[in-house]
């Protein structure tokens, strides 16, 4: 029995699927994580839902998500980073479902920022640049990036690059003259932690120069 | 069935060096936290040392912080402690344990470490 | 730093219940989970209650666990002695990354 005879909307919500994700962000605000949680099923009823996680915290056993809207969200310093915390979806005391889970293997880092392309007349070739909050953290500092562009008007041909360092040379005859490209890029963790893709960054727009006829090269 | 065996004990001098391993097997190794404890003869148990699952993260007590390294190889599910400038109070049985989802649901047999001139 | 204080030997006869107690130095015994191993004569240790009052797969329920906070203690309670239940417990707990035991208790089961 559930021993929520009484209360209908608990008997319902028992029958319900409460699968969920979760992400942390390291060092995400100063010597702060963050932990954030949703569930997979948007349409899941959450009026009465809370997210408690439990272990491998300092000098607390448990601690109480903030409900943001869909998301469930907690930042704070007291995640030890070793070993395994639970994590429960509940209503009221009762745990509806849980997930042992090591907050160093669901590491989604933060977006790369100041993406930007220059065009080296010289050299016939395009240097990409762009930055990331990691290259001054004390855990998450090593990433795998994910360059990405296309032409403007491939809606779905992307090309993707990945690198290990924020700056990549795009050689100019690989591009097609006087076109408009999209270029974004986004990272993931590389180096004993393990996790998921960031956001990707802005979106960067750079054009091709026209072919020289008589060189048969770019303008 | 889990599995741990720690060996690589023995006696030494003292101010001498000894690796300790401890061989893993019947469960994930590379999602384990895995740690090092000791017992001196006829006393309690003493924390040592711990790993994350990965490596980046160690800690030590403060007796052997300095003299002692753990470390682990997983694609060989091995635990090490690399155990340098030894004393005679390091005499102990050295355990390996496992963290799992709890400290410590699984133990090794253990090691005899002796330091002794 | 904190220590966990526990007594050094208590006794039971066949049948009875006892309880180890283990008590925080400083801070409270509520922050951080307390564990509980067995360590027969001549054996490695092994969990007989983790996370203050779970009990391993394979323990009998004659094991418990709890937490005291106006005590700022831990305590193991066996109830329904039996011989095999004589060996040394500790408790352990944490202390940010590292792990606090207990000095340990032995427990003599009485003929």
């Known amino acids: 029995e559930s021993g929520y005879a009484q209360n209908g909307d608990l008997e319902d919500a028992e029958l319900d699927d409460y699968s969920f994700s979760c992400y942390s962000q390291l060092e995400v605000n100063g010597s702060q994580h963050s932990l954030t949680c949703a569930f997979e099923d948007p349409d899941v009823n959450i009026t009465n839902l809370e997210f408690e996680i439990c272990g491998a915290l300092v000098e607390v056993k448990c601690l109480n998500f903030r409900k943001l809207q869909e998301i469930y969200f907690i930042e704070t310093k007291k995640f030890l980073l070793i070993g395994k915390s639970n994590i429960c979806v509940k209503v009221g005391e009762k745990s509806l479902t849980c997930k042992k889970i090591d907050l160093t293997t669901i590491v989604k880092p933060e977006a790369p920022f100041d993406l930007s392309v220059v065009y080296r007349e010289g050299a016939n070739d395009f240097v990409v640049t762009f930055n990331t909050s990691h290259l001054q953290k004390k855990y998450v500092k090593v990433l795998m990036h994910d360059v990405a562009y296309r032409q403007e008007k491939d809606e779905n041909k992307w090309t993707h690059v990945n690198l290990s360092s924020t700056k990549l040379t795009l050689l100019q005859r690989k591009l097609q003259p006087a076109a408009m490209y999209e270029i974004k890029v986004r990272s993931i963790p590389d180096h004993y932690f393990k996790g998921f893709w960031s956001e990707w960054s802005p979106s960067y727009y750079f054009r091709t120069p026209e072919i020289n006829n008589s060189s048969g090269e770019m303008d | 069935q889990v599995n741990l065996r720690e060996s690589g004990g023995g006696l030494v001098k003292p101010g001498g060096s000894l690796r300790l391993s401890c061989a893993a097997s019947g469960f994930t190794f590379d999602d384990s936290v895995m740690h090092w404890v000791r017992q001196a003869p006829g006393k309690g148990l003493e924390w040592l040392s711990l790993?994350?699952?990965?490596?980046?993260?160690?800690y030590y007590a403060d007796s052997v912080k300095g003299r002692f390294t753990i470390s682990r190889d997983n694609t060989k599910n091995l635990l090490y402690l690399q155990m340098n400038s030894l004393r005679a109070e390091d005499t102990a049985v050295y355990y390996c344990?496992?963290?799992?989802?709890?400290?410590?649901?699984?133990w090794g047999q253990g090691t005899l470490v002796t330091v002794s001139s | 730093n904190f220590m966990l204080t526990q007594p050094h030997s208590v006794s039971g006869s066949p049948g009875k219940t006892v309880t180890i107690s283990c008590t925080r130095s400083?801070?409270?015994?509520?922050?951080?989970?307390v564990q509980w191993y067995q360590q027969r004569p001549g054996n490695s240790p092994t969990t007989v209650i983790y996370?203050?009052?779970?009990?391993p797969s394979g323990v009998p329920d004659r094991f418990s666990g709890s937490i005291d906070s106006s005590s700022n203690s831990a305590s193991l309670t066996i109830s329904g002695l039996v011989t095999e239940d004589e060996a040394d417990y500790y408790c352990?707990?944490?202390?940010?990354?590292?792990?606090?035991f207990g000095g340990g208790t032995k427990l003599t089961v009485l003929c």
């Open positions: 352990q707990s944490y202390d940010f990354h590292h792990l606090v």
């Open positions: 790993v994350g699952w990965d490596g980046f993260f160690t």
């Open positions: 344990a496992r963290q799992g989802d709890y400290m410590g649901n699984n």
């Open positions: 996370e203050d009052d779970q009990r």
């Open positions: 400083s801070g409270s015994i509520d922050s951080s989970y």
